[in-house]
Amino acid sequence: ELCDDDPPEIPHATFKAMAYKEGTMLNCECKRGFRRIKSGSLYMLCTGNSSHSSWDNQCQCTSSATRNTTKQVTPQPEEQKERKTTEMQSPMQPVDQASLPGHCREPPPWENEATERIYHFVVGQMVYYQCVQGYRALHRGPAESVCKMTHGKTRWTQPQLICTGEMETSQFPGEEKPQASPEGRPESETSC
Protein backbone atom coordinates (compact mmCIF):
# COMPACT_ATOMS: atom_id res chain seq x y z
CA GLU A 1 0.00 0.00 0.00
CA LEU A 2 1.53 3.30 -1.10
CA CYS A 3 1.60 6.20 1.36
CA ASP A 4 -0.68 9.02 0.20
CA ASP A 5 1.56 11.86 1.30
CA ASP A 6 5.21 12.71 1.60
CA PRO A 7 6.87 12.45 5.02
CA PRO A 8 6.18 15.56 7.11
CA GLU A 9 8.49 18.52 6.89
CA ILE A 10 9.62 20.14 10.12
CA PRO A 11 11.49 23.40 10.71
CA HIS A 12 15.25 23.43 10.17
CA ALA A 13 15.54 19.70 9.46
CA THR A 14 15.79 17.26 6.58
CA PHE A 15 14.81 13.62 6.39
CA LYS A 16 16.33 10.53 4.80
CA ALA A 17 15.34 6.89 4.51
CA MET A 18 18.17 4.56 5.47
CA ALA A 19 16.63 1.63 3.63
CA TYR A 20 13.54 1.26 1.48
CA LYS A 21 10.72 -1.21 2.04
CA GLU A 22 9.78 -3.61 -0.73
CA GLY A 23 7.19 -1.92 -2.91
CA THR A 24 8.94 1.48 -2.81
CA MET A 25 9.15 3.17 -6.19
CA LEU A 26 11.81 5.66 -7.30
CA ASN A 27 10.97 7.87 -10.28
CA CYS A 28 13.44 7.77 -13.16
CA GLU A 29 14.05 11.54 -13.39
CA CYS A 30 16.73 13.14 -15.53
CA LYS A 31 18.54 16.43 -15.09
CA ARG A 32 17.78 19.43 -17.29
CA GLY A 33 18.71 18.83 -20.92
CA PHE A 34 18.21 15.08 -20.58
CA ARG A 35 15.22 12.76 -20.77
CA ARG A 36 14.40 9.11 -20.14
CA ILE A 37 15.35 6.86 -23.03
CA LYS A 38 12.43 5.76 -25.19
CA SER A 39 10.96 2.55 -23.78
CA GLY A 40 12.95 3.23 -20.61
CA SER A 41 11.49 2.53 -17.18
CA LEU A 42 9.33 5.15 -15.51
CA TYR A 43 10.54 4.03 -12.11
CA MET A 44 12.70 1.58 -10.19
CA LEU A 45 10.90 -0.81 -7.84
CA CYS A 46 12.23 -2.40 -4.66
CA THR A 47 11.33 -6.09 -4.90
CA GLY A 48 12.55 -9.28 -3.35
CA ASN A 49 11.96 -12.51 -1.53
CA SER A 50 12.51 -13.50 2.10
CA SER A 51 16.28 -13.56 1.73
CA HIS A 52 17.14 -10.76 -0.67
CA SER A 53 15.74 -7.43 -1.88
CA SER A 54 16.90 -5.36 -4.83
CA TRP A 55 15.80 -2.67 -7.27
CA ASP A 56 14.06 -3.86 -10.42
CA ASN A 57 14.43 -1.86 -13.65
CA GLN A 58 17.18 0.61 -14.39
CA CYS A 59 16.87 4.31 -14.99
CA GLN A 60 18.56 5.63 -18.11
CA CYS A 61 18.82 9.18 -19.37
CA THR A 62 19.78 10.50 -22.78
CA SER A 63 20.42 13.98 -24.07
CA SER A 64 17.27 15.77 -25.17
CA ALA A 65 19.24 17.19 -28.09
CA THR A 66 20.29 13.82 -29.56
CA ARG A 67 18.37 10.90 -30.94
CA ASN A 68 20.82 8.26 -29.63
CA THR A 69 20.14 6.35 -26.45
CA THR A 70 22.89 6.30 -23.88
CA LYS A 71 24.00 3.24 -22.02
CA GLN A 72 23.85 3.32 -18.24
CA VAL A 73 27.35 3.72 -16.89
CA THR A 74 28.87 4.49 -13.53
CA PRO A 75 28.38 8.22 -12.94
CA GLN A 76 31.33 10.55 -12.97
CA PRO A 77 32.33 12.12 -9.63
CA GLU A 78 31.07 15.57 -10.66
CA GLU A 79 27.66 14.09 -11.47
CA GLN A 80 27.44 12.47 -8.08
CA LYS A 81 28.05 15.83 -6.42
CA GLU A 82 24.81 17.17 -7.84
CA ARG A 83 22.68 14.72 -5.86
CA LYS A 84 20.99 16.37 -2.92
CA THR A 85 18.70 13.92 -1.30
CA THR A 86 20.95 10.93 -0.83
CA GLU A 87 23.98 12.70 0.61
CA MET A 88 22.70 12.71 4.18
CA GLN A 89 24.38 9.56 5.36
CA SER A 90 25.89 8.16 8.41
CA PRO A 91 25.77 10.21 11.60
CA MET A 92 22.05 9.64 11.72
CA GLN A 93 22.08 6.08 10.42
CA PRO A 94 20.62 3.88 13.16
CA VAL A 95 20.74 0.57 11.32
CA ASP A 96 22.92 -1.13 8.75
CA GLN A 97 20.93 -0.98 5.52
CA ALA A 98 22.01 -4.45 4.54
CA SER A 99 20.76 -5.95 7.83
CA LEU A 100 17.10 -5.06 7.29
CA PRO A 101 15.20 -7.92 5.65
CA GLY A 102 12.57 -6.86 3.13
CA HIS A 103 14.37 -3.60 2.41
CA CYS A 104 16.53 -2.27 -0.43
CA ARG A 105 19.61 -0.12 -0.03
CA GLU A 106 19.88 3.35 -1.53
CA PRO A 107 20.09 2.79 -5.31
CA PRO A 108 23.36 3.91 -6.88
CA PRO A 109 23.22 7.09 -8.98
CA TRP A 110 22.68 6.82 -12.72
CA GLU A 111 24.20 8.99 -15.40
CA ASN A 112 22.56 12.42 -15.79
CA GLU A 113 20.14 11.77 -12.93
CA ALA A 114 18.06 14.71 -11.68
CA THR A 115 19.34 16.51 -8.59
CA GLU A 116 16.46 15.34 -6.37
CA ARG A 117 15.04 11.87 -6.06
CA ILE A 118 11.30 11.34 -5.91
CA TYR A 119 10.34 8.25 -3.92
CA HIS A 120 6.89 6.73 -3.50
CA PHE A 121 6.93 5.12 -0.07
CA VAL A 122 4.86 2.23 1.25
CA VAL A 123 3.17 1.65 4.60
CA GLY A 124 5.74 0.77 7.25
CA GLN A 125 8.48 2.95 5.75
CA MET A 126 10.55 4.85 8.30
CA VAL A 127 12.47 8.04 7.63
CA TYR A 128 14.98 9.72 9.92
CA TYR A 129 15.43 13.43 10.56
CA GLN A 130 18.44 15.53 11.38
CA CYS A 131 18.97 19.23 11.86
CA VAL A 132 20.33 21.26 8.98
CA GLN A 133 23.69 22.96 9.26
CA GLY A 134 23.67 25.75 11.85
CA TYR A 135 20.99 24.09 13.98
CA ARG A 136 21.17 21.47 16.69
CA ALA A 137 18.75 19.03 18.25
CA LEU A 138 17.17 20.20 21.48
CA HIS A 139 17.45 16.75 23.01
CA ARG A 140 18.08 13.15 22.02
CA GLY A 141 14.48 12.04 21.63
CA PRO A 142 12.89 10.21 18.70
CA ALA A 143 13.76 11.75 15.33
CA GLU A 144 11.82 9.59 12.92
CA SER A 145 8.50 9.31 11.15
CA VAL A 146 6.70 6.14 10.08
CA CYS A 147 4.02 5.76 7.42
CA LYS A 148 1.07 3.99 9.05
CA MET A 149 -2.36 2.85 7.99
CA THR A 150 -5.11 4.16 10.29
CA HIS A 151 -8.86 3.98 9.62
CA GLY A 152 -8.09 2.84 6.08
CA LYS A 153 -5.99 5.95 5.38
CA THR A 154 -2.24 6.31 5.36
CA ARG A 155 -0.49 8.97 7.40
CA TRP A 156 2.98 9.74 8.66
CA THR A 157 3.63 10.03 12.37
CA GLN A 158 4.84 13.44 13.48
CA PRO A 159 8.62 13.58 14.10
CA GLN A 160 9.54 14.97 17.50
CA LEU A 161 12.93 16.41 16.63
CA ILE A 162 13.25 20.09 17.54
CA CYS A 163 16.11 21.94 15.87
CA THR A 164 17.31 25.19 17.34
CA GLY A 165 19.79 27.84 16.22
CA GLU A 166 22.49 29.26 18.50
CA MET A 167 20.75 32.60 19.13
CA GLU A 168 17.44 30.97 19.91
CA THR A 169 19.01 28.72 22.53
CA SER A 170 20.81 31.54 24.33
CA GLN A 171 17.64 33.64 24.41
CA PHE A 172 15.48 30.89 25.86
CA PRO A 173 16.06 30.16 29.53
CA GLY A 174 14.48 27.25 31.33
CA GLU A 175 16.37 24.43 29.72
CA GLU A 176 16.59 21.36 31.89
CA LYS A 177 18.30 18.26 30.63
CA PRO A 178 17.95 15.26 32.91
CA GLN A 179 20.39 12.38 32.71
CA ALA A 180 17.79 9.77 31.87
CA SER A 181 18.15 8.40 28.36
CA PRO A 182 15.08 8.84 26.19
CA GLU A 183 13.28 6.15 24.27
CA GLY A 184 14.42 6.13 20.71
CA ARG A 185 11.55 4.27 19.14
CA PRO A 186 8.87 5.74 16.96
CA GLU A 187 5.47 6.13 18.53
CA SER A 188 2.82 3.56 17.80
CA GLU A 189 -0.62 5.07 17.73
CA THR A 190 -3.48 2.79 18.51
CA SER A 191 -5.86 2.22 15.63
CA CYS A 192 -9.59 2.27 16.09
Epitope: H139, Q160, A180, S181, P182, E183, S188, E189
Partner: antibody
Framework: EVQLVQSGAEVKKPGESLKISCKGS????????IGWVRQMPGKGLEWMGI????????KYSPSFQGQVTFSADKSTSTAYLQWSSLQASDTAMYYC?????????WGQGTLVTVSS | DIQMTQSPSTLSASVGDRVTITCRAS??????LAWYQQKPGKAPKLLIY???SLESGVPSRFSGSGSGTEFTLTISSLQPDDFATYYC?????????FGGGTKLEIK
Protein backbone atom coordinates in the same frame (compact mmCIF):
# COMPACT_ATOMS: atom_id res chain seq x y z
CA GLU B 1 -8.23 7.40 19.49
CA VAL B 2 -5.74 9.99 20.73
CA GLN B 3 -6.97 11.75 23.88
CA LEU B 4 -5.61 14.18 26.45
CA VAL B 5 -7.75 14.24 29.60
CA GLN B 6 -7.12 16.93 32.18
CA SER B 7 -7.94 17.06 35.88
CA GLY B 8 -10.94 19.05 37.12
CA ALA B 9 -11.41 22.71 37.97
CA GLU B 10 -9.62 24.10 41.01
CA VAL B 11 -10.41 27.00 43.35
CA LYS B 12 -7.45 28.15 45.43
CA LYS B 13 -6.35 30.98 47.67
CA PRO B 14 -3.33 33.19 46.93
CA GLY B 15 -0.11 31.62 48.23
CA GLU B 16 -1.37 28.05 47.96
CA SER B 17 0.29 25.39 45.82
CA LEU B 18 -1.36 23.41 43.04
CA LYS B 19 -0.59 20.58 40.64
CA ILE B 20 -2.89 19.84 37.70
CA SER B 21 -2.61 16.81 35.44
CA CYS B 22 -2.99 15.74 31.81
CA LYS B 23 -3.29 12.05 30.95
CA GLY B 24 -2.54 10.92 27.40
CA SER B 25 -3.95 7.82 25.73
CA UNK B 26 -4.22 6.31 22.26
CA UNK B 27 -0.58 6.95 21.36
CA UNK B 28 2.93 6.40 22.69
CA UNK B 29 2.97 9.13 25.34
CA UNK B 30 6.74 9.01 25.88
CA UNK B 31 7.49 9.90 22.28
CA UNK B 32 5.57 13.16 21.94
CA UNK B 33 6.28 16.52 23.50
CA ILE B 34 3.48 17.83 25.72
CA GLY B 35 2.94 21.58 25.86
CA TRP B 36 0.92 23.85 28.11
CA VAL B 37 -1.15 26.83 26.98
CA ARG B 38 -2.71 29.50 29.20
CA GLN B 39 -5.87 31.42 28.39
CA MET B 40 -6.81 34.16 30.83
CA PRO B 41 -10.52 35.10 31.04
CA GLY B 42 -11.64 36.76 27.79
CA LYS B 43 -8.08 36.76 26.41
CA GLY B 44 -6.00 34.95 23.81
CA LEU B 45 -3.73 31.91 23.92
CA GLU B 46 -0.27 32.02 25.51
CA TRP B 47 2.41 29.37 25.09
CA MET B 48 3.91 28.30 28.42
CA GLY B 49 6.43 25.72 27.22
CA ILE B 50 6.92 22.01 26.67
CA UNK B 51 8.11 18.81 28.28
CA UNK B 52 9.33 15.60 26.68
CA UNK B 53 7.81 12.81 28.79
CA UNK B 54 10.42 10.35 27.53
CA UNK B 55 13.28 12.02 29.37
CA UNK B 56 11.66 15.01 31.12
CA UNK B 57 13.56 17.60 29.10
CA UNK B 58 11.69 20.88 29.62
CA LYS B 59 11.58 24.22 27.83
CA TYR B 60 9.80 27.17 29.39
CA SER B 61 8.64 30.31 27.68
CA PRO B 62 10.51 33.27 29.25
CA SER B 63 7.24 34.70 30.65
CA PHE B 64 6.64 31.52 32.65
CA GLN B 65 10.19 30.61 33.61
CA GLY B 66 10.40 30.33 37.39
CA GLN B 67 6.64 30.73 37.77
CA VAL B 68 5.57 27.14 37.03
CA THR B 69 7.09 23.67 36.87
CA PHE B 70 6.43 20.95 34.29
CA SER B 71 6.85 17.28 35.09
CA ALA B 72 5.78 13.97 33.61
CA ASP B 73 5.38 10.36 34.64
CA LYS B 74 5.73 8.14 31.61
CA SER B 75 4.64 5.05 33.54
CA THR B 76 1.15 6.57 33.91
CA SER B 77 1.27 8.63 30.68
CA THR B 78 0.60 11.77 32.69
CA ALA B 79 2.05 15.28 32.48
CA TYR B 80 1.78 17.82 35.29
CA LEU B 81 1.78 21.59 35.65
CA GLN B 82 2.40 22.95 39.11
CA TRP B 83 2.64 26.20 41.07
CA SER B 84 4.33 26.55 44.46
CA SER B 85 2.60 29.84 45.32
CA LEU B 86 -0.44 30.89 43.35
CA GLN B 87 -1.39 34.50 42.67
CA ALA B 88 -4.70 36.01 41.59
CA SER B 89 -3.13 36.64 38.16
CA ASP B 90 -2.81 32.86 37.67
CA THR B 91 -6.59 32.65 37.29
CA ALA B 92 -7.04 31.13 33.82
CA MET B 93 -7.91 28.10 31.75
CA TYR B 94 -4.90 25.84 31.23
CA TYR B 95 -4.72 23.46 28.29
CA CYS B 96 -2.30 20.62 27.71
CA UNK B 97 -1.50 19.99 24.05
CA UNK B 98 0.42 17.51 21.94
CA UNK B 99 3.33 19.23 20.21
CA UNK B 100 5.89 20.32 19.48
CA UNK B 101 4.93 22.18 16.30
CA UNK B 102 1.31 22.56 15.32
CA UNK B 103 -0.92 21.39 18.15
CA UNK B 104 -3.08 18.58 16.83
CA UNK B 105 -4.63 17.38 20.09
CA TRP B 106 -5.81 19.46 23.05
CA GLY B 107 -7.01 18.55 26.51
CA GLN B 108 -10.43 19.86 27.53
CA GLY B 109 -8.77 22.43 29.79
CA THR B 110 -8.51 22.92 33.55
CA LEU B 111 -9.97 26.11 34.99
CA VAL B 112 -7.87 27.46 37.85
CA THR B 113 -9.43 30.20 39.96
CA VAL B 114 -7.30 31.99 42.53
CA SER B 115 -9.24 34.23 44.87
CA SER B 116 -9.08 35.27 48.50
CA ASP C 1 10.34 36.14 20.34
CA ILE C 2 8.48 36.13 17.04
CA GLN C 3 5.42 38.38 17.31
CA MET C 4 2.23 37.40 15.49
CA THR C 5 -0.29 40.11 14.64
CA GLN C 6 -3.79 39.21 13.53
CA SER C 7 -6.29 41.47 11.80
CA PRO C 8 -9.03 42.33 12.14
CA SER C 9 -9.59 41.65 15.84
CA THR C 10 -13.35 41.44 15.21
CA LEU C 11 -15.12 40.63 11.96
CA SER C 12 -18.86 40.77 11.32
CA ALA C 13 -20.19 38.65 8.47
CA SER C 14 -23.23 36.76 7.27
CA VAL C 15 -23.84 33.12 6.40
CA GLY C 16 -22.63 32.52 2.84
CA ASP C 17 -20.03 35.31 2.94
CA ARG C 18 -16.41 34.78 1.93
CA VAL C 19 -14.16 35.98 4.75
CA THR C 20 -10.42 36.45 5.08
CA ILE C 21 -8.35 36.78 8.25
CA THR C 22 -4.76 38.01 8.07
CA CYS C 23 -1.79 37.08 10.23
CA ARG C 24 1.60 38.83 10.09
CA ALA C 25 4.85 37.59 11.62
CA SER C 26 7.51 39.97 12.92
CA UNK C 27 10.14 38.01 10.96
CA UNK C 28 10.07 35.35 8.26
CA UNK C 29 8.65 32.03 9.45
CA UNK C 30 8.72 30.31 6.04
CA UNK C 31 5.47 28.29 5.95
CA UNK C 32 5.55 27.21 9.60
CA LEU C 33 2.11 28.52 10.51
CA ALA C 34 -1.02 26.91 11.94
CA TRP C 35 -4.60 28.16 12.29
CA TYR C 36 -7.04 27.20 15.06
CA GLN C 37 -10.75 27.70 15.68
CA GLN C 38 -12.07 28.16 19.22
CA LYS C 39 -15.69 28.22 20.33
CA PRO C 40 -16.76 29.57 23.74
CA GLY C 41 -16.05 27.14 26.56
CA LYS C 42 -14.17 24.73 24.27
CA ALA C 43 -10.54 23.95 23.53
CA PRO C 44 -9.11 25.27 20.26
CA LYS C 45 -9.21 22.97 17.24
CA LEU C 46 -6.48 22.69 14.61
CA LEU C 47 -7.68 23.72 11.13
CA ILE C 48 -4.57 24.29 9.01
CA TYR C 49 -0.86 23.56 9.40
CA UNK C 50 2.18 24.41 7.29
CA UNK C 51 0.29 27.53 6.15
CA UNK C 52 -1.97 25.72 3.69
CA SER C 53 -2.35 22.04 4.64
CA LEU C 54 -5.86 21.18 5.76
CA GLU C 55 -6.07 19.06 8.91
CA SER C 56 -7.95 15.79 8.47
CA GLY C 57 -11.70 16.18 8.97
CA VAL C 58 -11.73 19.96 8.47
CA PRO C 59 -14.23 21.16 5.81
CA SER C 60 -12.74 22.21 2.48
CA ARG C 61 -14.30 25.68 2.73
CA PHE C 62 -11.33 26.52 5.00
CA SER C 63 -8.08 27.31 3.24
CA GLY C 64 -4.78 28.91 4.16
CA SER C 65 -2.15 30.68 2.13
CA GLY C 66 0.99 32.75 2.46
CA SER C 67 4.65 32.36 3.37
CA GLY C 68 7.39 34.45 4.93
CA THR C 69 5.60 37.06 7.02
CA GLU C 70 2.09 37.37 5.52
CA PHE C 71 -0.58 34.70 5.87
CA THR C 72 -4.31 34.43 5.35
CA LEU C 73 -7.10 32.13 6.45
CA THR C 74 -10.08 32.12 4.10
CA ILE C 75 -13.53 30.67 4.64
CA SER C 76 -15.10 30.46 1.19
CA SER C 77 -18.74 30.36 2.28
CA LEU C 78 -19.52 30.98 5.93
CA GLN C 79 -21.66 28.40 7.70
CA PRO C 80 -23.50 28.97 11.01
CA ASP C 81 -20.98 26.67 12.71
CA ASP C 82 -18.05 28.89 11.69
CA PHE C 83 -18.82 31.81 14.03
CA ALA C 84 -15.97 31.50 16.52
CA THR C 85 -12.57 32.97 17.37
CA TYR C 86 -9.62 32.14 15.12
CA TYR C 87 -5.94 32.12 16.10
CA CYS C 88 -2.75 31.83 14.07
CA UNK C 89 0.39 30.29 15.58
CA UNK C 90 3.96 30.16 14.33
CA UNK C 91 6.25 27.17 14.85
CA UNK C 92 9.37 28.34 13.08
CA UNK C 93 10.81 28.70 16.58
CA UNK C 94 10.20 26.15 19.33
CA UNK C 95 9.14 29.11 21.45
CA UNK C 96 5.68 29.05 19.91
CA UNK C 97 3.65 32.25 19.67
CA PHE C 98 0.00 32.92 18.87
CA GLY C 99 -1.74 35.81 17.21
CA GLY C 100 -4.15 37.84 19.34
CA GLY C 101 -7.21 36.21 17.77
CA THR C 102 -10.00 37.26 15.42
CA LYS C 103 -13.57 37.02 16.66
CA LEU C 104 -15.90 36.20 13.79
CA GLU C 105 -19.44 37.26 14.68
CA ILE C 106 -22.82 37.29 12.97
CA LYS C 107 -23.65 40.57 11.23
Amino acid sequence: EVQLVQSGAEVKKPGESLKISCKGSGYSFSNYWIGWVRQMPGKGLEWMGIISPGDSTTKYSPSFQGQVTFSADKSTSTAYLQWSSLQASDTAMYYCVRGPYYLDYWGQGTLVTVSS
Amino acid sequence: DIQMTQSPSTLSASVGDRVTITCRASQSISSWLAWYQQKPGKAPKLLIYKASSLESGVPSRFSGSGSGTEFTLTISSLQPDDFATYYCQQYNSYLLTFGGGTKLEIK
